[in-house]
């Protein structure tokens, strides 16, 4: 808390301007009116004000809005943003994309902060929705952003959102994200036709069922093996030796560099090795000629 | 990477003034504060002041007012420093220098001109 | 302006040394003070920011720790390669200013 003194005579701020930056702490805090401050905030962020002197800046736009700034303050903050909290900006109601792009500007290049998630979910959570525009800038700012939501989170994606995702932006989701995300780039992309669907849904495989990979190797899609070992493990299960043969395409021959890792080592587990030999790999570990296989998981949901 | 490039060394005159560079690349030259910094032998550091390349904007410390002149040139990504009346006193190791806003540390520094004023 | 005083103008260490170098601000600072490195014919190099956060690629054994008018940057286990002179800086207003340096030498 910055002491009540008077301002010295003739320092008494007209304007906000460079001059200021000379000032003390107390100096500021006396002979800056708070309103002039807000009227100019646009100015602020060209000044190279010190972040101790930020305090003050922000000292005097607390006691000004004490109930949150309004939105044409939160604009201008600049590097004023940085002396936030999150309890501060609970009390924003940020509205305007472009607000939401000034702020994010002043903490680029750095990890999300507690105050930048505060702010997205505010923001988003004033939209109702994660459109495209605003996902768009969010994972413009933060790659990673999609995939720090929870699956709840996420269902509020709409579709036509989907568009606007890069493969990168997927690069640390789990598979309970992708099992929410999946789905809904399969309805955006639905009426491209096979090898540009493929391109666009192929980073969203993660969640995609076995009925949906059995499709795909009708489809001479060629998928390359980091993205099959993304897939979900209960869905390659059930693919047969000529299906995975064909949804691999030429990359089937990396098979047997991953056989020892999921989903490839479960998946040889459960096919006849007669089968597995007919790819010439060398993959081992197949169901020996001559053994029969039971479905227990069937029987029991039968009985 | 980022880089300032300096001079290596300028010897003058007493009463002259010289004219020092600061080149940069590595980064958007327009988007950041550029500082210059003194160094006399064997003492520490003195700020002398910053300008903005975008806006021409300039702060000096009140010591160096009648002594440094900032300047840049933004289509050669170049700040300049003149230093003018020179003196014995002025004989010292100057760099430019890039900071972090709005904490006012300095993460780039230039490579520093050695400045010699002699007869 | 703000004084920033580095008391000791010269400390004698040996490889493997815990070492202490201070500085002292005229005014309360908050945590707003920066420490470099400098060997001869070099340019300064970044080391400590905001009084206790290491530059990127900095080794950990440099640590800084302070607020207000006291602060200190300690190198855990003197290596030949750390010796050098050390500045401190304060950033909290206006004009910026420069502590005169400690400079490391062997015993």
């Known amino acids: 808390e910055v002491e009540k003194t008077a301002c010295p005579s003739g320092k008494k701020a007209r304007e906000i301007d460079e001059s200021l930056i000379f000032y003390k702490k107390w100096e500021l805090e006396a002979c800056v009116d708070a309103a002039l401050l807000a009227t100019q905030m646009d100015r602020v962020n060209a000044i190279p004000f010190t972040y101790e002197q930020l305090d003050v800046l922000k000292h005097k736009l607390d006691e000004l809005y004490p109930q949150g700034y309004p939105e044409s303050v939160i604009q201008h903050l600049g590097y004023l943003f940085l002396k936030m909290s999150p309890e501060d900006i609970r009390k924003w109601n940020v509205t305007s994309l472009e607000t939401l792009k000034a702020l994010l500007e002043v903490n680029k290049g750095h990890e999300m902060s507690p105050q930048v998630a505060t702010l997205i979910d505010r923001f988003v959570k004033g939209r109702g929705q994660l459109d495209k525009d605003t996902l768009d800038t969010l994972t413009a700012f933060y790659p990673g952003y999609l995939c720090s939501l929870s699956p709840e989170e996420l269902s509020s994606v709409p579709p036509s959102s989907i568009w606007a995702v890069r493969p990168q932006d997927l690069d640390t989701c789990d598979p309970r994200q992708l099992d929410v995300l999946y789905p809904k780039a399969r309805l955006a992309f639905q009426n491209m036709n096979g090898s540009e669907y493929f391109v666009k849904i192929q980073s969203f495989l993660g969640g995609a069922p076995t009925e949906d990979l059995k499709a795909l190797s009708q489809q001479n899609v060629s998928m390359d093996l980091a993205t099959f070992m993304k897939l979900r493990t209960d869905a390659v299960l059930p693919l047969t030796v000529a299906e995975v043969q064909k949804l691999l395409g030429p990359h089937v021959e990396g098979l047997k560099a991953e056989e020892r890792h999921r989903p490839v080592r479960d998946w040889i587990l459960r096919q006849r090795q007669d089968d597995l030999d007919t790819l010439g790999l060398g993959l081992q570990g197949g169901i020996p000629n001559g053994y029969l296989v039971l479905d227990l998981s069937m029987q029991e949901a039968l009985s | 990477q980022v880089q300032l490039q300096q001079p290596g060394a300028e010897l003058v005159k007493p009463g002259a003034s010289v004219k020092l560079s600061c080149k940069a690349s590595?980064?958007?030259?327009?988007?950041?504060?550029m500082h210059w910094v003194k160094q006399r032998p064997g003492q520490g550091l003195e700020w002398i002041g910053m300008?903005?390349?975008?806006?021409?904007?300039?702060n000096y410390n009140e010591k160096f007012k009648s002594k440094a002149t900032l300047t840049v040139d933004k289509s050669s990504s170049t700040a300049y420093m003149q230093l003018s009346s020179l003196t014995s006193e002025d004989s010292a190791v100057y760099y430019c220098?890039?900071?972090?806003?709005?904490?006012?540390?300095?993460?780039?520094w230039g490579t520093g001109t050695t400045v010699t004023v002699s007869s | 302006d703000i004084v920033m005083t580095q008391s000791q103008k010269f400390m004698s260490t040996t490889v493997g040394d815990r070492v202490s170098i201070t500085c002292k601000a005229s005014q309360n600072v908050g945590t707003a003070v920066a420490w470099y490195q400098q060997k001869p014919g070099q340019s300064p190099k970044l080391l400590i920011y905001?009084?206790?956060n290491r530059y990127t690629g900095v080794p950990d054994r440099f640590t800084g720790s302070g607020s207000g008018t006291d602060f200190t940057l300690t190198i855990s286990n003197m290596q030949s390669e750390d010796l050098a002179d050390y500045f401190c800086q304060q950033s909290s207003s206006y004009p910026l200013t420069f502590g005169a340096g400690t400079k490391l030498e062997l015993k």
């Open positions: 905001s009084a206790s």
């Open positions: 590595g980064y958007t030259f327009t988007s950041y504060w």
């Open positions: 300008i903005h390349p975008n806006s021409g904007s300039t």
């Open positions: 220098a890039r900071p972090v806003v709005p904490y006012w540390y300095f993460d780039v």
